[in-house]
């Protein structure tokens, strides 16, 4: 069985205010079986930011179609990007159970906001 | 809610094909993977066929591969599955069904009959 | 294949769990379908191994563990008489399969 790795290939991503941010995910594997999720942050304080079992997420959208059964592409895109969204985000793959439990991280992902041009 | 509508069944004889169609209410179709599922006579439920929620992505069962092609108008809110080469064997209550994240079904159609009978 | 029980019964009250093996737990999520009358439409009681839908009471319960799945209705009624048909997804094969059926009776 081939051993699932998640690569964010952007260590960095800097987006205006106001604009979109896309964050690159793909996975090698498609075992264990469960769901993606995205976070901001790490350790307890972290922030959900999107969840592929659970929904809507208003602000977030894949880039790939998810409903596709061998789709490996969790990529998102965040629309109108505020300097609160600002931090690492991170892709991570949880391993079905009662409940879900984390089985692998993405690097991570550092998105920076610049001010809106004027 | 949640509504699923069948339609499109009927008497036809062996060799001849027939178009089911399930409408959909109540929810983003567009955002969903659906499949077809049918019950034979005294028998039990068999899947089908499915497709992803943007139609570009569709998956068979072995024994109807070829035959059955299954489909889906965003714009109308519609699932279809033509069926050619109709045998006996297939004379059955048809259902739509819309899938969950992972491919398993929350909401299913009331069904419609196919009869296959020279 | 997923293979299940033909039939269980019970007593009003009492618990009864309803188990389908076959699948593999790395790779395979599991749903549970309840059917009233041949020809009628299935109603999802679990789907995702153990994620109930709102509209279900919650005396239904769903649990997956190696290869096996088990449906749990605690506390079972007299309107729980139906056939219940499990079902599984596995991401090897990107195909759904379906046990044969468990003929609920209620006494």
């Known amino acids: 069985e081939e051993e699932l790795q998640i690569i964010q290939p952007d260590k960095s991503v800097s987006v205006a205010a106001g604009e979109s941010a896309i964050l690159h995910c793909t996975i090698t594997s498609l075992f264990p079986v469960g769901p993606i999720q995205w976070f901001r942050g790490a350790g307890p304080a972290r922030v959900l930011i999107y969840n592929q079992r659970q929904g809507p997420f208003p602000r977030v959208t894949t880039v790939s179609e998810t409903t596709k059964r061998e789709n490996m592409d969790f990529s998102i895109s965040i629309s109108n990007i505020t300097p609160a969204d600002a931090g690492t985000y991170y892709c991570i793959k949880f391993r079905k159970g009662s409940p879900d439990t984390e089985f692998k991280s993405g690097a991570g992902t550092e998105l920076s906001v610049r001010a809106k041009p004027s | 809610d949640v509504q699923l509508v069948e339609s499109g069944g009927g008497v036809v004889r062996p060799g001849e094909s027939l178009r089911l169609s399930c409408a959909a209410s109540?929810?983003?179709?567009?955002?969903?993977?659906m499949s077809w599922v049918r019950q034979a006579p005294g028998k039990g439920l068999e899947w089908l066929a499915g497709?992803?929620?943007?139609?570009?992505?569709?998956y068979y069962i072995d024994s109807v591969k070829g035959r059955f092609t299954i489909s889906r108008d965003n714009s109308k809110n519609s699932l279809y599955l033509q069926m050619n080469s109709l045998t006996a064997e297939d004379t059955a209550v048809y259902y739509c069904?819309?899938?969950?994240?992972?491919?398993?079904?929350?909401?299913w159609g009331l069904g419609t009959l196919v009869t296959v009978s020279s | 294949a997923l293979t299940q029980p033909a039939s269980v019964s019970a007593n009003p009250g009492e618990t009864v769990k309803i188990t389908c093996s076959g699948g593999?737990?790395?790779?395979?999520?599991y749903g549970w379908y309840q059917q009233k009358s041949p020809g009628s439409a299935p109603v999802t009681v679990i789907?995702?191994?153990?994620k109930r839908p709102s509209d279900i009471p919650s005396r239904f319960s769903g649990s997956a563990s190696g290869s096996a799945a088990t449906l749990t209705i605690t506390g079972v009624r007299v309107e729980d008489e139906a056939v219940y048909y499990c079902a599984g997804y596995d991401g090897r094969t990107y195909i759904n399969t379906f046990g044969a059926g468990t003929t609920l009776t209620v006494l």
């Open positions: 497709i992803s929620a943007g139609g570009s992505d569709t």
């Open positions: 593999d737990w790395y790779s395979t999520y």
């Open positions: 069904a819309r899938e969950t994240w992972n491919h398993l079904f929350d909401y």
């Open positions: 109540g929810f983003t179709f567009s955002s969903y993977a």
């Open positions: 789907h995702s191994d153990d």
